[in-house]
Interface confidence: medium
């Protein structure tokens, strides 16, 4: 299973070759290698070379590139051969960059943090804006507020909650400071009477493949609200899920592959295998969406240089329903939020 | 370590209903498929419900369809089933199992304490 | 619903022996099929998982096998800790149904 997207394909067609034009050949057959591979600077990937013949230490970022001395995978680079017109022959690599994203006539690069305003954070994941919630007041609290109201405060960002019938709050209850919470002012202390306040996880990106899913918390330091991330893949783009629903049935809530098989991340390989649960299909017009799921760390080694671990959002259980009308719509949760109209515009 | 932590014991009149909860402390209710499994004194196990992952809802077994009500409060992290027109027969431990979800279908590997349900006149 | 026969319905054996418990579905389940440990007054606990694989925390005396529609729960060498009533389960489809029970007991 991979988790890794397709890179964004970057091609151009070259300009045919002028007759006068001579293209070297880099690689030569059969395959001459030295006896021993050479031993590459630390975090330099050891490669097969773009001739499938010998082992090669991965040109970097800015390096020269050929069809031989190729780009190194693991580090997401491309060979660009722009710059040599009209041969093609000598590029140099460059970052394999997704596709960026326009909103309200701006663009966005692929992997940017934004803010539209001071309510939502957003992010670009290969041309789908994600957003969360900076305003994160917590719900009012039921036991002694028998009259909440959501407020705007003069000169404040976010709503607040309050309370009609203070007079009757119980002493044990204020731990809520709003100044905790609100995320116009640059704050820098901590609370004592800070709520720890964890946002669900916002829809994942993509509808299939791999995608990105983001929320928001204050458990840290500061008390300050923070955006986490973790990898989602609601289901494989390339495996046609209706074909695996039972006769009789109209859904398969979730679907799972036969075999396990590691993870991988930029040509790096999960240490585990793995049997992931997907968020299955419906031959009517209801869409699955996950209904029970965790968080799990998933540990990667890379070929060459160190591992590290990524969060992945693991489905447990999905069901399929009528409401989501579009099963992954990045705005989905926002549309509760009354300044929706400010990001979705 | 998951623990599922359930309500206490029952004394119950036939034709009345029980509720029994099934609390999982310091873990999320939405990372688990809940059952219910119940076992009379001196019987084997009786599987009753709990969530079918490959229709993505709450199933029955057909003896206690229309009579058992399986629901979850992800607020609190509690599972709850409810058990209408109670009769003597009824009367049995009641458990609470989940499954920990790496595959579709999942053997029940934590499971409540049991609460004692009795239905007497 | 799958019927799940287990057999034998109780058992008697000296410590160190080699106890099998046998349960068979009445149609494929695959592999899906575990074997639980009930001890007097507790609640039962999982030793087996998807027919042959041991339950973490499990003593590895325990040990699981399929067959078809077999399936077999071994016990290599008896300990008096054992002593406990052993179900088997198909969670395949549901309704997810158990077998009877053997009752294990030591001589």
């Known amino acids: 299973t991979a988790l890794s997207p397709t890179p964004t394909t970057m091609t151009f067609t070259p300009a045919p070759l002028e007759e006068t034009t001579t293209r070297p050949e880099f690689c030569k057959w059969p395959c001459e290698c030295p006896q021993s591979p050479p031993r590459c600077p630390l975090g330099v990937s050891l490669i097969t070379d773009g001739c499938e013949c010998c082992k090669i230490c991965a040109q970097q970022l800015g390096d020269n590139c050929t069809e031989a001395a190729i780009c190194d995978p693991h580090r997401g680079l491309y060979c660009d051969y722009s710059g040599d017109r009209p041969r093609y022959a000598i590029g140099v690599c460059a970052q394999v960059v997704g596709v960026g994203c326009v909103l309200d006539g701006v663009r966005y690069t692929n992997g940017e943090s934004f803010q539209p305003n001071c309510r939502y954070n957003c992010t670009c994941i290969d041309g789908t804006v994600g957003c969360t919630p900076l305003c994160l007041s917590p719900r009012p609290p039921r036991l002694w507020c028998r009259q909440p109201r959501h407020v705007r405060v003069p000169g404040q960002c976010c709503e607040q909650w309050v309370c009609d019938d203070d007079a009757r709050r119980p002493r044990q209850t204020a731990l809520l400071d709003t100044r905790a919470f609100a995320a116009s002012g640059a704050v820098e202390q901590r609370y004592e009477n800070c709520i720890a306040y964890t946002s669900p996880w916002s829809p994942c990106s993509t509808t299939c493949g791999l995608g990105i899913s983001t929320r928001i918390s204050n458990v840290n330091a500061r008390c300050w609200p923070e955006q986490e991330s973790r990898l989602c893949n609601l289901r494989p783009c390339d495996v046609d899920i209706q074909l695996h629903i039972k006769a009789g049935k109209k859904c398969l809530a979730v679907y799972q592959p036969e075999e396990a098989t590691n993870f991988t991340l930029a040509g790096c390989v999960s240490t585990r295998t793995y049997r992931p649960k997907y968020c299955g299909v419906c031959t009517d017009n209801r869409c699955c969406i996950p209904y029970k799921s965790k968080t799990i760390s998933v540990d990667f080694q890379c070929p060459e240089g160190p591992g590290f671990s990524r969060q992945v959002l693991w489905i447990n259980a999905c069901f399929c329903n009528l409401s989501c009308r579009n099963p992954n719509d990045i705005f989905a949760d926002l549309e509760s939020y009354p300044d929706f109209e400010e990001i979705a515009n | 370590e998951v623990q599922l932590l359930e309500s206490g014991a029952e004394v119950k009149k036939p034709g009345a209903s029980v509720k029994v909860s099934c609390r999982v402390p310091?873990?999320?209710?939405?990372?688990?498929?809940m059952h219910w499994v119940r076992q009379a004194p001196g019987k084997g196990l009786e599987w009753m419900g709990g969530f079918d992952p490959e229709d993505g809802e709450t199933i029955y077994a057909q003896k206690f369809q229309g009579r058992v009500t399986m629901t979850e409060d992800t607020s609190t992290d509690t599972a709850y089933m409810e058990l209408s027109s109670l009769r003597s027969e009824d009367t049995a431990v009641y458990y609470c199992?989940?499954?920990?979800?790496?595959?579709?279908?999942?053997?029940?590997?934590?499971w409540g304490q049991g609460t004692m349900v009795t239905v007497s006149s | 619903d799958i019927v799940m026969t287990q057999s034998p319905s109780s058992l008697s054996a000296s410590v160190g022996d080699r106890v099998t418990i046998t349960c068979r579905a009445s149609?494929?389940?695959?592999?899906?099929l575990a074997w639980y440990q009930q001890k007097p007054g507790k609640a039962p606990e999982l030793l087996i998982y998807?027919?042959?694989s041991l339950q973490s925390g499990v003593p590895s005396r325990f040990s699981g096998s399929e067959s078809g529609t077999d399936f077999t729960l071994t016990i290599s060498s008896l300990q008096p800790e054992d002593v406990a009533s052993y179900y088997c389960?198909?969670?395949?489809?549901?309704?997810?149904?158990f077998g009877q029970g053997t009752k294990l007991e030591i001589k």
């Open positions: 389960q198909q969670y395949k489809t549901a309704p997810y149904t």
């Open positions: 199992a989940a499954s920990g979800g790496w595959e579709v279908h999942d053997a029940f590997d934590t």
């Open positions: 149609q494929d389940i695959s592999y899906y």
């Open positions: 998807a027919g042959s």
């Open positions: 310091g873990y999320s209710l939405s990372e688990l498929s």
